[in-house]
């Protein structure tokens, strides 16, 4: 008996060939001997089976002695043995229809679980193997689970169902809803305008939800909500913004926030959360702000940074085109009685300068100028 595997919702073509290469009488029946379809001369006739309007044949092939049974929009319950009667002989074909579906939605939040469920006909014992877009293989039986979805899991999952040495392949498009970056850091000199961007790692036709940026300033004892906003069909509208600092928000995606100016009291970490309509859970992106200030008070030239810096970052004070006068893995450095000239305060990581602030030290009878 020939075995054919089909996919739920697809179309399958079961072949039946006569030895005579001409149009002769044929019938397709199911295992209950109920007629599905056949011919009467050049006309197609249909029986009382439940396939009825989903069953068809190719009249153009009859003259060549081919009498296929075409079943459209396959259902699991179409799994059966189909019998083709032609020239006093019977050809049996076993059709097994499988379905593979994602547990709920194919749009899942980062960190959520993906469960793929195999629908199979009674009596079958298939095995399933799925390959994720990043090349990870997962094997299972009737259900396959992947916990803690990551951004790289977005894309087409290819799943192969194996039964009776035959294979059928399913392709499922999974969209992992996440921000492009889990975390970002912005380095700014005091007084500069600060731009925060929160690009999404996915595109959908309509995007609706609400979001909020909570900010924990390094100097503050508790976090504070800086802005709340709504998202409707990719249009951003601000619901509430603190008076100080007064953030500005772009009206279109990607989510974009502007802090009027970098100040030591704003340095710290923020957490932008986005709750999407009809989704449980939230998307998160962490953002960090490091602020540098260089000042000269009396005979002391000081450079300070505020915000979340790593212990390996180096803070230096140097006179332009000269070696660093002071260089420390600390958040403040200073030089007593600095020479006149343009001093540079540098925040660097393994030699790469992240932030630079210049301050002009005038001869002792003058006051300093901040360019």
């Amino acid at each position: 008996k020939k075995v054919v595997l089909g996919k739920k919702g697809d179309t399958v073509e079961l072949t039946c060939t006569a030895s005579q290469k001409k149009s002769i009488q044929f019938h397709w029946k199911n295992s209950n001997q109920i007629k599905i379809l056949g011919n009467q001369g050049s006309f197609l006739t249909k029986g009382p089976s439940k396939l009825n309007d989903r069953a068809d044949s190719r009249r153009s092939l009859w003259d060549q002695g081919n009498f296929p049974l075409i079943i459209k929009n396959l259902k699991i319950e179409d799994s059966d043995t189909y019998i083709c009667e032609v020239e006093d002989q019977k050809e049996e074909v076993q059709l097994l229809v499988f379905g593979l579906t994602a547990n709920s939605d194919t749009h899942l939040l980062q960190g959520q679980s993906l469960t793929l469920t195999l629908e199979s006909p009674p009596g079958s014992s298939p095995s399933v193997q799925c390959r994720s877009p990043r090349g990870k293989n997962i094997q299972g039986g009737k259900t396959l689970s992947v916990s803690q979805l990551e951004l790289q899991d977005s894309g087409t999952w290819t799943c192969t169902v194996l039964q009776n040495q035959k294979k059928v392949e399913f392709k499922i498009d999974i969209v992992v809803l996440a921000f492009q970056k889990a975390s970002s850091i912005v380095y700014k000199k005091e007084g500069e305008q600060v731009e925060f961007s929160f690009p999404l790692a996915f595109t959908v036709e309509k995007l609706t939800g609400s979001g909020e940026l909570w900010w924990q300033a390094e100097r503050a004892s508790s976090s504070k909500s800086w802005i709340t906003f709504d998202l409707k069909n990719k249009e951003v509208s601000v619901k509430r913004v603190t008076q100080d600092p007064k953030l500005q928000m772009g009206k279109k995606l990607p989510l974009h926030l502007t802090l009027p100016q970098a100040l030591p009291q704003y340095a710290g970490s923020g957490n932008l959360t986005l709750a999407l309509e009809a989704k449980t859970g939230k998307l998160h992106q962490e953002v960090n702000l490091v602020v540098m200030r260089a000042t000269q008070l009396q005979k002391n030239l000081t450079c300070e940074v505020w915000g979340p810096t790593s212990p390996k970052l180096m803070l230096s004070l140097k006179l332009e085109n000269k070696e660093a006068k002071v260089s420390k893995r600390e958040k403040a450095v200073w030089v007593l009685n600095p020479e006149a000239g343009m001093w540079q305060c540098l925040l660097s990581d393994s030699g790469q300068v992240l932030l630079e602030s210049n301050i002009k030290v005038l001869p002792t009878w003058s006051t300093p100028v901040q360019p």
């Epitope: 913004v241 008076q243 030591p264």
Partner: antibody
């Protein structure tokens, strides 16, 4: 101590412009937002707008938006409010103000009287 | 814009008595457990003076005779007991949303 000192009274003709200054001292000028408030004679208080002196980012009340420009000069610790196309109903005392530790305006300039008269 | 309506427009109180001024906001000025309402006192020829911020916090240097209460849309400034030099106009102001707005003022006279 924190002080905000404003420029002196001005008399202007309708259609002219006026630029009021507010010199700050006693704190780091770039650390705090400077606000401008209008008070017409015998009337209440009306918020005009604000400036972040460090970056120069300014925001203003839609009612004044087309006619007002708020600026700041870090080198002199001075904020400015310029009002153009003056009308008689612009005759008022204009105050600059700064927040304290809370959300209210704890520090105020002494006010500048602007008279618009033909 | 958030409209703030103060009542009464004027008030005459005897020294030692209690003076109560109310301020009603056109929409709630509450957020995250705080009420963004401030109160000021203004005497003729002077700039306003901050008395209360965030509905009930007394600004430093202000006598405890002044107190603020309320949340949402309804707020109250109480002066108890009133003293001679409390003669002034009192304003409420919301710092919840731009544009920042003030009440029309309440004139307090001491009998």
């Amino acid at each position: 101590q924190v002080q905000l000192v404003q420029s002196g009274a001005e008399v202007k003709k309708p259609g002219a412009s006026v630029k009021v200054s507010c010199k700050a001292s006693g704190y780091t000028f770039t650390d705090y937002v400077i606000h401008w408030v209008k008070q017409a004679t015998g009337q209440g208080l009306e918020w005009i707008g604000e400036i972040y002196p460090g970056s120069g980012s300014a925001y203003s009340n839609a009612k004044f938006k087309d006619r007002v420009t708020i600026t700041a000069d870090k080198s002199t610790n001075t904020a400015y409010m310029e009002l153009r196309s003056l009308r008689s109903d612009d005759t008022a005392v204009y105050f600059c103000a700064r927040r304290g530790n809370g959300t209210g305006f704890a520090y105020w300039g002494q006010g500048t009287l602007v008279t618009v008269s033909s | 814009d958030i409209v703030l309506t103060q009542s009464p427009a004027s008030l005459a109180v005897s020294p030692g008595q209690r003076a109560t001024i109310t301020c009603k906001a056109g929409q709630s000025v509450d957020y995250d457990g705080d009420s963004y309402m401030n109160w000021y006192q203004q005497k003729p020829g002077q700039p306003p003076k901050l008395l209360i911020y965030v509905a009930s916090n007394l600004e430093s240097g202000i006598p405890s005779r002044f107190s603020g209460s309320g949340s949402g849309t309804d707020f109250t400034l109480t002066i108890n007991p009133v003293e001679e030099n409390d003669t002034a106009t009192y304003y409420c102001q919301q710092s919840y949303k731009d544009p920042l707005t003030f009440g029309q003022g309440t004139k307090v006279e001491i009998k």
